[in-house]
């Protein structure tokens, strides 16, 4: 690879949990997206909050590390868990440079895969993602 | 096949600004990062900055922040570098490259009174 | 700023024979995310430059398989097994692990 990987950066308000030290945030200004040139990986993610058909931005940026998902060249994004009755946090990881800026669609939430009665449930190193 | 064309050559006087383009061909232009690396006569090459088109996110080296804008129009794919605030030590031929694998031809700018 | 050192800064080569160069980094170039972004160009005259190697060790498409890079840290050579005429130029290294991004100063490669 020629370059170090750059993804989208962004945290929503209330989130606990900053994923800002796993990357080098780029002076980007206030009209573009922010970037983070990532530190420890060559992975970016994504993570929305659907809501009765309304899709949240969560946080976008750099994975810790590379693991499986990382060599999507595109955001798709599976169900992850339930943080509250009646939305889905989906998330997603992907290998380009700003490929979490947005996903290619989002599956309904009743779709295979999304977390039954067990409560919320993460892939290893989500953790820090599911504290919301 | 890849190519990246580049504007003609400039004669500017000190404090002047210059701008000159880029054209990409061969490749989706929105995918790569576009660098912009010049060289100074007799001398090695120095890395001004980066635009990814898709997006216009850019990142420079601190030297040239403040002098250097770097854009883009993806209707022609083309990438622009405006340098302002010229002096003598900016004589250099400018070139832009594709993530550096791919390299325009330069643009060789003087700075001359 | 992250320095690059290449030596030697001639280098007069018999056509056939082999040629090395060296190229020092003033810090490591190994990223956090295990990837060593070094990179070797070649600039024939009145030619922009041309990328060779990329990843250390990895040959850019179209390039000659008597080009190879190697090393890690601090140290990288890059080598060529037999001088052909055409490899006439200067070569230079380049790191991109570090903001500002920087090259080497260049090594001119001459027929002897």
């Known amino acids: 690879p020629p370059n170090r990987r750059t993804c989208v950066f962004f945290e929503a308000p209330g989130v606990r949990g900053s994923t800002k030290t796993l990357g080098e945030l780029l002076d980007t200004g206030t009209e573009l997206p922010r970037a983070i040139r990532c530190l420890y990986s060559r992975c970016c993610f994504g993570i929305w909050n659907l809501t009765q058909d309304r899709a949240q931005v969560e946080m976008q940026g750099c994975r810790d590390s590379d693991e499986p998902g990382c060599e999507s060249l595109h955001c798709d994004p599976s169900p992850r868990a339930h943080p509250s009755p009646g939305s889905t946090l989906f998330t997603c990881s992907c290998g380009t440079d700003f490929c979490n800026a947005n996903y290619s669609h989002l599956p309904p939430p009743g779709s295979p895969g999304t977390p039954g009665s067990q409560g919320p449930q993460a892939a290893p190193g989500e953790s820090i993602w599911m504290a919301l | 096949q890849v190519q990246l064309v580049q504007s003609g050559a400039e004669v500017k006087v000190p404090g002047a600004s210059v701008k000159m383009s880029c054209k990409a061909s061969g490749y989706t232009f929105t995918d790569y990062w576009v660098s912009w690396v010049r060289q100074s006569p007799g001398q090695g090459l120095e890395w001004i900055g980066e635009i990814y088109p898709k997006n216009g996110v850019s990142n420079f080296n601190e030297k040239f922040k403040g002098r250097v804008t770097l854009t883009v129009d993806k209707s022609t794919s083309t990438a622009y570098m405006e340098l302002r605030s010229l002096r003598s030590d900016d004589t250099a031929v400018y070139y832009c490259?594709?993530?550096?694998?791919?390299w325009g031809q330069g643009v060789l700018v003087t700075v001359s009174s | 700023d992250v320095v690059m050192t290449q030596s030697p800064l001639s280098l007069p080569v018999t056509l056939g024979q082999p040629a090395s160069i060296s190229c020092r980094s003033s810090?490591?170039?190994?990223?956090?995310?295990?990837?060593?972004?070094l990179e070797w160009f070649q600039q024939r005259p009145g030619q922009s430059p041309r990328r060779l190697i990329y990843?250390?060790?990895n040959r850019f498409s179209g390039v000659p398989d008597r080009f190879s890079g190697s090393g890690s840290g601090t140290d990288f050579t890059l080598k060529i097994s037999r001088v052909e005429a055409e490899d006439v130029g200067v070569y230079y290294c380049f790191q991109a692990t570090h903001d500002p991004n920087t090259f080497g100063q260049g090594t001119k490669l001459e027929i002897k």
């Open positions: 810090q490591s170039l190994e990223y956090g995310d295990g990837y060593t972004y």
């Open positions: 490259t594709r993530q550096r694998d791919y």
């Open positions: 990843g250390v060790s």
